[in-house]
């Protein structure tokens, strides 16, 4: 038998420095977790102790903190090279800065193969990107070889900016011929490494003949066998075993997100490349693991530019940006409008001639807006200012919800109106009218939403049975501020871009902003 140790990360999202337990900014270092310096310590420890080790990443290194905003992927290549990753799969966020923003900082600089079998380049891009990412790679490990085949969410055109010259094929359809090719090359140990979410990971394990192990990402799935070491609740055992259509037991793993854990899977293969056994668990990268001093010193060196960036002007406002709780938790506030407009702007994807855009709606809990910005400081808006408005390091995500769920969410928005609670919703692409004289749960008297399948956008009444796309903070998608109905009833959830980055990009693009209060949220009494 031959034993392989697979170390894996996914959805690191720019968490190069250690973070707090909830993956936000590290405040108390003695209780912080993750970061590449700590990850390196653990990886090196395992490499020294075990003979056949692969370090893999399942995508979405890009996007999530000021590190990505400033360095635009150069930081990913540099520190993944330093950690000596063996392979990476492309995630949807790797396309956030367009194809050029992937090619230059990452594909050209990585000293490891970057993989995706279901992304096919066409037109002028085909020759430009040829060889810079691969469908699969055969890696020598000890005296054996292991085939790694990559895949990426086919929803990427709706989630990021891959442009028109990349075609995202069905994962299973694209993977099978590549796996077959590996088999003809006498590679009998094959790992599918990719970024399409846990449900697709399980389908790949079930349907793609010849795949021995699936290492996934995108859904931030936490798997664990036994007593979990932190706050994350396991979605299943680690590894999650899927019985393939041809009767094999295929281990499927994922390692939550944000570099908080290092996935650790030990696989035993027989001489014909069949998996005999698999076991392991994600390793919590807490402060009991020291940060590697040389990587830490490198991080500190790279940090200097970030500190300078946060005080530079992004754009100007010529109006007061009212992000006060007195406004944003009680009525439409122009800071809420600004943020929602930025959220929609960040998700403009003209992927279908029938639609002016795939999404038109935004909701945002007023309690998530933590500060105003005064225009009397020469109108200057900096990253630092925005960090005071949006201090939680969240993301603005894309969900699909039924109209009935949205109606419940808006009822929840005002179910205890007047107590300065955070659940009061700010909106974009929505006109809502509340009647507070009615009883809680029956206060939404009008709810109109901006059409998407139209050439001239206009507001139509919400249809209860229709499925709508909505941009919202990950906090709401996860049921925060009591929006349990969103968490329980959402039909799809894709994580998006860092909140501050979305707003800063919008302000930089607009240069001068003047958001108004314009009647998105209204109150009526009695007859309407």
């Amino acid at each position: 038998a031959w034993e392989l140790t697979i170390l894996h990360t996914n959805d690191v999202h720019s968490r190069l420095e250690q973070t707090s337990e909830d993956s936000s900014k590290c405040v108390n270092a003695s209780r912080c977790m993750g970061g590449v310096a700590r990850l390196f310590t653990k990886v090196q420890q395992i490499r020294r102790a075990e003979p056949n080790v692969l370090l893999l990443d399942a995508g979405d290194q890009y996007q999530g903190t000021i590190w990505f905003t400033v360095y635009k992927g150069a930081e990913v290549a540099h520190f993944m090279n330093a950690l000596r990753y063996d392979a990476m799969a492309l995630g949807n966020h790797e396309f956030d800065n367009g194809v050029e923003g992937l090619i230059e900082p990452l594909l050209k600089e990585a000293k490891f193969p970057i993989l995706s079998a279901n992304i096919k380049a066409k037109g002028p891009l085909a020759s430009q990107i040829s060889g810079l990412y691969l469908p699969y790679k055969v890696l020598p490990v000890g005296d054996e070889v292991v085939g790694i085949v990559g895949y990426t969410s086919k929803e990427t055109p709706f989630l990021s900016n891959p442009g028109t010259n990349l075609v995202f094929e069905d994962e299973i359809t694209a993977l099978q011929p590549e796996v077959d090719k590996l088999k003809t090359l006498n590679v009998n140990k094959i790992i599918a490494l990719g970024h399409s979410g846990f449900e697709m990971d399980k389908l790949i394990a079930q349907k793609v003949r010849g795949v021995d192990v699936v290492v996934g990402g995108h859904s931030n799935t936490f798997l664990y066998t036994g007593n979990p070491p932190s706050k994350e609740v396991p979605a299943g055992k680690y590894p999650f075993i899927v019985t393939s259509d041809d009767g094999r037991k295929v281990p499927v793993v994922q390692a939550y997100a944000f570099g908080k854990y290092l996935g650790y899977l030990k696989i035993e293969f027989d001489e014909r490349g069949n998996v005999i056994s698999s076991h392991g668990n994600p390793i919590l990268l807490n402060s009991s693991i020291p940060e590697d001093p040389s990587i830490k010193a490198d991080i500190n060196k790279w940090r200097i530019k970030l500190d300078n960036y946060s005080t530079q002007e992004l754009g100007k406002t010529i109006v007061y940006l009212d992000g006060s709780s007195q406004s944003c938790r009680f009525r439409e506030c122009n800071m809420g409008n600004l943020i929602c407009d930025a959220m929609i702007n960040n998700n403009l994807r003209h992927t279908d001639e029938m639609f002016w855009n795939h999404v038109s709606m935004c909701i945002l809990n007023g309690g998530g807006i933590r500060s105003p910005i005064d225009e009397r400081n020469n109108g200057t808006i900096t990253w630092e200012n925005l960090a005071a408005v949006l201090p939680f390091g969240g993301t603005f995500d894309l969900v699909q919800l039924k109209g009935s769920t949205l109606k419940k969410a808006f009822e929840h928005s005002v179910h205890r109106y007047g107590q300065s609670t955070g659940e009061f919703l700010q909106v974009g692409g929505i006109h809502v009218v509340y009647d507070l004289s009615r009883k809680p749960g029956d206060r939404v008297v009008k709810l109109d939403v901006l059409c998407t399948k139209c050439r001239v956008p206009s507001y139509d009444p919400l249809k209860m049975d229709e499925v709508y796309k909505v941009i919202l903070p990950n906090f709401l998608a996860n049921g925060g501020d009591g929006f349990q109905m969103i968490k329980d009833e959402l039909l799809r959830h894709d994580s998006g871009d860092q909140d501050i980055n979305v707003v800063s990009t919008y302000i930089s693009k607009m240069k001068v902003i003047y958001p108004a209060v314009e009647g998105r949220i209204k109150f009526s009494t009695g007859s309407h």
């Epitope: 230059e104 050209k108 490891f112 020759s127 990107i129």
Partner: antibody, heavy 117, light 107 residues
């Protein structure tokens, strides 16, 4: 297949400059960095610098800083290395090499430069 | 700059022999080491990058191992076309630096 064809041998006087070309074929020129390396008689190989053909970004060995200039003509899929203020110790074979995964991987056939008064 | 020390500087062997060449870096270069072959009057030909990954078309009798500061190139069964000079280079950090070479001759 990847081919890097370099210009012919040069004989130069001390103090002069030399410009060596490297024409790439068999791949998309702008997609890969190009290294320049030299091999002087009886000396170990020396890395001179590299260039990103898509944006002209360069990195140079400090030993040659100020004397070496690496450029590209993307329309001709050609990289150039110019070395100025030549001295006798610059007599060497100069190679271009395509960079893959960080490393020089595919090499040109070499250009002999002789510096002699 | 990182110094690369190769040993031996020359060695004699016969067809079918197993041959090992070593390369030592003056500091940790992770796994970012390339081995290449050069025949007299010819361009270098890269064989292995990142310590142990063979470039396309390189015969499987060539293999590499090591990490950190100590690295090895092994030719499991020498063929007549393998007699040449072998070099290592590190690309962990700039400037890229080279070993002094190992001349492999027919015994």
């Amino acid at each position: 297949q990847v081919q890097l064809v370099q210009s012919g041998a040069e004989v130069k006087k001390p103090g002069a400059s030399v410009k060596v070309s490297c024409k790439a074929s068999g791949y998309t020129f702008t997609s890969y960095w190009m290294h320049w390396v030299r091999q002087a008689p009886g000396q170990r190989l020396e890395w001179m610098g590299n260039i990103n053909p898509s944006n002209g970004g360069t990195k140079y060995n400090e030993k040659f800083q100020g004397r070496v200039t690496i450029t590209v003509d993307t329309s001709a899929s050609t990289a150039y290395m110019e070395l100025s203020s030549l001295r006798s110790e610059d007599t060497a074979v100069y190679y271009c090499a395509r960079r893959d995964y960080g490393s020089p991987s595919y090499w040109g056939q070499g250009t002999t430069v002789t510096v002699s008064s | 700059d990182i110094q690369m020390t190769q040993s031996p500087s020359s060695l004699s062997a016969s067809v079918g022999d197993r041959v090992t060449i070593t390369c030592r870096a003056s500091q940790d270069i992770n796994s970012y080491l390339t081995w290449f072959q050069q025949k007299p009057g010819k361009a270098p030909k890269s064989l292995i990058y990142r310590t142990n990954i063979l470039l396309d078309g390189v015969p499987s009798r060539f293999s590499g191992s090591g990490s950190g500061t100590d690295f090895t190139l092994t030719i499991s069964s020498l063929q007549p076309e393998d007699f040449a000079t072998y070099y290592c280079l590190q690309y962990h950090e700039f400037p890229v630096t080279f070993g002094g070479g190992t001349k492999l001759e027919i015994k």
